[in-house]
Amino acid sequence: KELKVTQPEKSVSVAAGDSTVLNCTLTSLLPVGPIKWYRGVGQSRLLIYSFTGEHFPRVTNVSDATKRNNMDFSIRISNVTPEDAGTYYCVKFQKGPSEPDTEIQSGGGTEVYVLAKPS
């Protein structure tokens, strides 16, 4: 099956202090390789979450990524701050035998817009 990375929402708005879910699904787990979430693109992009076991404060996976045939790589960001605003990308990599993993596909991005907390 052809690999497609889908981020269904173009944008989400969230009040500061609340949590938000960024959705991402894959049509195939092949080729073998990790899925990572980034904010921004190019040189300035920032790794937000990796489905490879490391701990990321305030960011958790929504479904159990270790389950066989799980295609849902959505994440939850809790206690959102204005600094979390930006465009988030769900990116699939292909595992390299010795060289670094190769980026092969990306979702279209989800813009996170942070609203001031209602008083």
Epitope: T87, S106, G108
Partner: antibody, heavy 119, light 108 residues
Framework: DVQLVESGGGVVRPGESLRLSCAAS????????MNWVRQAPGEGLEWVSL????????YYADSVKGRFTISRDNSKNTLYLQMNSLRAEDTAVYYC????????????WGLGTLVTVSS | ETVLTQSPGTLTLSPGERATLTCRAS??????LAWYQEKPGQAPRLLIY???SRATGIPDRFSGSGSGTVFTLTISSLQSEDFAVYYC??????????FGGGTKVEIK
């Protein structure tokens, strides 16, 4: 059929204000993100601003940030662009553009309205 | 911000000829790229989205290809109504959404 009709253009002096309107019909206006895109004489297209269907999410190009305000009235199926502190370089045809519901490209455009800023 | 560079600036061809327009992105936009046609006094028209999918009602002489940083719009056999200005637009790196500078296809 989708119809987008811009109005409100005209000739103003530097520093003055103008409000553009875009009357929309033929689709469920409140369900779609809307944009303003402009084209200066003899130049290419330049994205100006975007507003989400609910009006909650708003973005501006750096060139107009702090001077232009985008808004919408979903009960009137109308998009607005309030332009303050106008400059000569704001002279352009201003197009209202309806976004695709999944991605940020433009399915439908109006014919545009000409804004001329000149002393 | 992702910069899009279109080439050539002007393409001078005769009806029936094949037109090949190129759009280069300063960094990968995968296939998140659209093409538009603009004629004087008319609203811009979406031709291609997703780098290669034709929009509704667009004739099959228009085709798009490419991914990553290099994209091509091909008009297989130019008709009189195809002489216009063509713009590419990326919608991956955003905001801002960015357009190329345009390619004018004019009659020889």
């Amino acid at each position: 059929d989708v119809q987008l009709v811009e109005s409100g253009g005209g000739v103003v002096r530097p520093g003055e204000s103008l409000r553009l309107s875009c009357a929309a019909s033929g689709f469920t206006f409140s369900s779609y993100d809307m944009n303003w895109v402009r084209q200066a004489p003899g130049e290419g297209l330049e994205w100006v601003s975007l507003i989400s269907g609910s009006g909650e999410i708003i973005y501006y190009a750096d060139s107009v940030k702090g001077r232009f305000t985008i808004s919408r009235d979903n009960s009137k199926n109308t998009l607005y662009l309030q332009m303050n502190s106008l400059r000569a370089e704001d002279t352009a045809v201003y197009y209202c553009a309806k976004e695709n519901n999944r991605y940020r490209f433009f399915d439908d455009w109006g014919l545009g309205t000409l804004v001329t800023v000149s002393s | 911000e992702t910069v899009l560079t279109q080439s050539p600036g002007t393409l001078t061809l005769s009806p029936g000829e094949r037109a090949t327009l190129t759009c280069r992105a300063s960094q990968s936009v995968y296939t998140y790229l659209a093409w538009y046609q603009e004629k004087p006094g008319q609203a811009p028209r979406l031709l291609i989205y997703g780098a290669s999918s034709r929009a509704t009602g667009i004739p099959d002489r228009f085709s798009g290809s490419g991914s990553g940083t290099v994209f091509t719009l091909t008009i297989s056999s130019l008709q009189s109504e195809d002489f216009a200005v063509y713009y590419c637009q990326q919608y991956y790196d955003r905001p801002p959404l960015t357009f190329g500078g345009g390619t004018k296809v004019e009659i020889k």
